[in-house]
């Protein structure tokens, strides 16, 4: 599980996998979190040791048992990796260190007026990893207000020295604050040249890109597919850099895929984990454990829960199965990537979700959210199924949310169409985050058919569900993807990680929000919910969510949008935002249409002529 405690005056003995210099224990912990093998760390502040070479030393450690003996060392700080800690996992580090010079390769010097300006320059420079700034009181006049942009082979300082009137810090590119912008394109049949900084095996170019994004010196990559002509190079992901920051040349090459690090993306970074499961693929590596489980999703969950597990293979070979359970091979390697990838097997493979930062936070404390009501801004690609239902009469305005459940299907609330049943007036925007980004040129979907539940009555809370068939199917992208639906009559699953999203009012008498808001809300039992609504019947076709103290809730404009819950590493559409007594009121949970109760209806309405369901359902 997630262990956040720090141990003062303690040093873990043994287990070393890497060492580096970091300015404080928190940065050391972050490096441990992102290191594939690190479970524990020990940090030596300048005050804790006389040996100049070991000052600011950050020692990353691994242990088969998950722990190591602690020895007393005055001033030392030790702790755990934040793997499995959900929202606490972040490569973003904003702190500025006064009286400290972080050494590295100085590749750019300029005069600036403040340390913040220096940090901004570093963030906006593709090669800058960290910086030092000499203040106006620095002892050598010619160096005052100098901003030195730096990098190093490992992304951390090559040394850290105590030096008066110098301030240092890190690039804020991992905070998605770079002004550079990024190249999302993946280039098929193209190989990039330049310097290889690392070589790993990956099942596809997307995993390769994520690894590149979180590698300190990778600016772009080339991936050799599993049909590449040289067998020994198949599935090789080459992480690359160059002096200029861009490839100096590219060569057309069959069965190669190239692309760029997404570290310079302005709005959001990809999660530092790989959630996709690869059927018919085996991942080779060092065996950690073998266990019998029911289904590949449980295998992935087992790997995620076993903190040292990096990736897994779920075997469907008859000799590896008994009854409904099959062997789940939990594996690891030195670099966190498989040592061998085999295709055409009877296995399914994937990665641990231990670094997913939208993971289930029930295991450890989370960074608190502050506004939907009481929510926070969402980031790009976080809720790719969320759509905005807008009406264009004289002006155009957002009225409701909805959820993409298939290429041509959106699920929403029936009450969104009260008084507006004409399909021509509606415009559906998908793959967006900011409503202000919508212009007359922004593509939108039109409605082919509105299917309102036959038992829904205007101004009543019952059967508040509707399907929208789009005129043309949508392509799936990282920002526009369907949400899986629950299984019919899903009553046994206990959901503990549920979120509501929308552009709705941020207070009861508020206004539509520009940035898509998200709020983490606990489910409330129907029995408890019923007690809070003295005059309305809470049926088994409804689900309630809210905090006892109120303060966080869906509101006007969120209607029709999703209540999604993450279970076994998969997001599911549990509810459709429907109604409530006001917004975020104390003891008045929001009421949502329970999607599981309408699965027969959804399946019936979305059946195509060839009898295949046209929406996303969990495997």
């Amino acid at each position: 599980g997630c262990l956040t405690q720090l141990y003062e005056n303690a040093f873990f003995r043994g287990g070393d996998v890497a060492s580096m210099y970091t300015p404080n224990a928190q940065y050391c912990q972050m490096r441990c979190t992102f290191h594939p093998r690190c479970l524990l760390f020990s940090f030596l502040p300048a005050s804790s040791i006389n040996d100049m070479e070991k000052r600011f030393g950050c020692f990353l450690k691994d242990s088969v048992t998950g722990t190591l003996p602690k020895v007393h060392r005055t001033g030392a700080v030790s702790g755990h990796s934040l793997k499995q800690c959900g929202h606490q996992i972040s490569a973003c580090h904003r702190d500025i260190y006064k009286g400290v010079d972080m050494r590295g390769v100085n590749f750019n010097v300029s005069k600036v007026s403040s340390v913040e300006e220096c940090q901004k320059r570093c963030t906006s420079n593709i090669r800058c990893q960290f910086f030092s700034y000499a203040t106006q009181t620095f002892h050598k006049a010619e160096y005052r207000n100098n901003c030195l942009l730096k990098y190093s082979p490992g992304g951390t300082p090559t040394a850290i020295k105590v030096l008066s009137n110098v301030e240092s810090g890190f690039s804020l590119k991992p905070c998605a604050l770079s002004e550079i912008g990024c190249h999302m394109n993946i280039f098929q049949h193209l190989a990039f040249s330049d310097v290889d900084v690392a070589r790993v095996l990956t099942p596809d170019a997307f995993v390769c890109r994520t690894i590149c994004t979180y590698h300190p010196n990778c600016l772009f990559f080339t991936f050799y597919t599993n049909v590449w002509k040289i067998e020994s190079q198949r599935n090789v992901c080459l992480l690359k850099t160059s002096e200029s920051g861009t490839p100096s040349s590219s060569t057309p090459q069959e069965n190669t895929i190239s692309g760029y690090s997404l570290l310079t993306c302005k709005r959001t970074l990809p999660e530092p984990c790989h959630s996709k499961i690869y059927p018919g693929v085996d991942f080779g590596g060092e065996e950690l454990n073998v266990t019998f489980v029911k289904g590949v999703n449980v295998c992935q969950e087992t790997c995620t829960k076993m903190i040292r597990c990096q990736f897994f293979t779920y075997s469907l070979l008859p000799e590896d199965c008994k009854e409904e359970k099959c062997k789940c091979f939990l594996r690891l390697s030195m670099d966190g990537s498989p040592t061998r990838i085999a295709y055409g097997t009877q296995g399914s493979s994937g990665y641990s979700l231990r670094l997913c930062n939208t993971g289930d936070n029930s295991v450890c404390t989370t960074k608190t959210s502050t506004r939907i009501v009481g929510g926070t801004n969402s980031s790009w690609g976080e809720w790719p199924w969320q759509v905005s239902l807008q009406v264009k009469l004289t002006a155009q305005r957002h009225l409701c949310g909805g959820s993409l459940i298939g290429h041509q299907w959106v699920l929403t609330a029936a009450h969104c169409f009260d008084g507006l049943p004409l399909q021509d007036v509606w415009r559906i925007y998908s793959g967006i985050l900011n409503l202000s980004d919508i212009t007359k040129d922004t593509p939108f979907s039109q409605i082919k058919e509105i299917i309102i539940h036959q038992n829904y009555k205007v101004s009543e809370g019952n059967h508040d569900i509707a399907l929208i068939k789009l005129q043309a199917p949508l392509n799936y992208t990282e920002f526009q993807k369907p949400i899986c639906l629950p299984s019919k009559g899903d009553t046994s699953t206990i959901y503990t990680n549920c979120w509501v999203t929308g552009w709705g009012f941020s207070k009861e008498k508020g206004e539509i929000q520009n940035i898509l808001q998200k709020v983490n809300i606990p489910l409330v039992t129907n029995e408890e919910c019923q007690k809070r609504y003295q005059d309305y019947k809470i049926t088994q076709r409804m689900v309630c969510a809210g905090y006892k103290e109120g303060g966080k809730d869906a509101c006007k404009g969120d209607s029709g949008g999703p209540l999604v819950c993450k279970h076994n590493g998969m997001w599911r559409l549990v509810g459709i935002t429907s109604w409530g007594e006001g917004c975020a009121r104390r003891e008045q949970p929001g009421v949502y249409t329970k999607v599981a109760e309408y699965m027969d209806w959804i399946l019936e309405k979305t059946q195509s002529s060839d009898g295949k369901a046209q929406m996303q359902s969990p495997a």
């Epitope: 009555k457 009543e460 007690k531 003295q534 005059d535 309305y536 019947k537 809470i538």
Partner: antibody, heavy 116, light 106 residues
């Protein structure tokens, strides 16, 4: 306007049964619960039970299980309370009420007198 | 079974008085208590639910408070139309009424 119209007063003999009705207007009984409450002369209120007319699910006060039977007819938007094996203890006003978590709107009540 | 003990059973007060009625539950009822007003020959009327939430249309002189097992209904400025019988109701576990408090003119 939400209204619950209860049937008229009943004078019944001990040991007999009686069926009281509660007809709703201004709302559909399927969308709510119908509760029944008893009030003996000059005494307090006692909850009898609750029916969900949509699926005929019922809940009763354990103390009076068997005495009362709740039913509903959604086509006529009417709920019923059947009382059996009547004794003088059952002489009371019987109220129907609609609501969710509790009784929000009440009918005018039906007086049942049990007398030989 | 949860028992509700209401007190006093009756009280005399004058217009303008502040009147307090209490209800004690035999177990913690998680604030799930409601208060009803009943006038002779009429059906009860919901005043307050969830300890302190005023039902719409009910004058603000009525207020509820309490937690755990002890709850109070307060009428801050008694009006002529407030002379009636008041009942508490727990709805945490099924439904149980208190015995009632008759508020009479002094």
């Amino acid at each position: 306007e939400v209204q619950l119209q209860q049937s008229g007063a009943e004078l019944v003999k001990p040991g007999a049964s009686v069926r009281l009705s509660c007809t709703a207007s201004g709302f559909n009984i399927k969308d709510t619960y119908i509760f029944w409450v008893k009030q003996r002369p000059k005494q307090g209120l006692e909850w009898i039970g609750r029916i969900d007319p949509e699926n005929d699910n019922t809940k009763y006060d354990p103390k009076i299980q068997g005495k009362a039977t709740l039913t509903a007819d959604t086509s006529s938007n009417t709920a019923y309370l059947q009382l059996s094996s009547l004794t003088s203890e059952d002489s009371a006003i019987y109220y129907c009420a609609k609501g969710g978590g509790l009784f929000a709107y009440w009918g005018q009540g039906t007086l049942v007198s049990v007398s030989a | 079974d949860i028992q509700m003990t209401q007190s006093p059973s009756s009280l005399s007060a004058s217009v303008g008085d502040r009147v307090t009625i209490t209800c004690e539950a035999s177990h913690d009822i998680n604030n799930y208590i409601a208060w009803y007003q009943q006038k002779p020959g009429k059906a009860p009327k919901l005043l307050i639910y969830y300890t302190s939430t005023l039902q719409s249309g009910v004058p603000s002189r009525f207020s509820g408070s309490g937690s755990g097992t002890e709850f109070t209904l307060t009428i801050s400025n008694l009006q002529p139309e407030d002379f009636a019988t008041y009942y508490c109701l727990q709805y945490d576990n099924l439904f149980t009424f208190g015995q009632g408090t008759k508020v009479e003119i002094k």
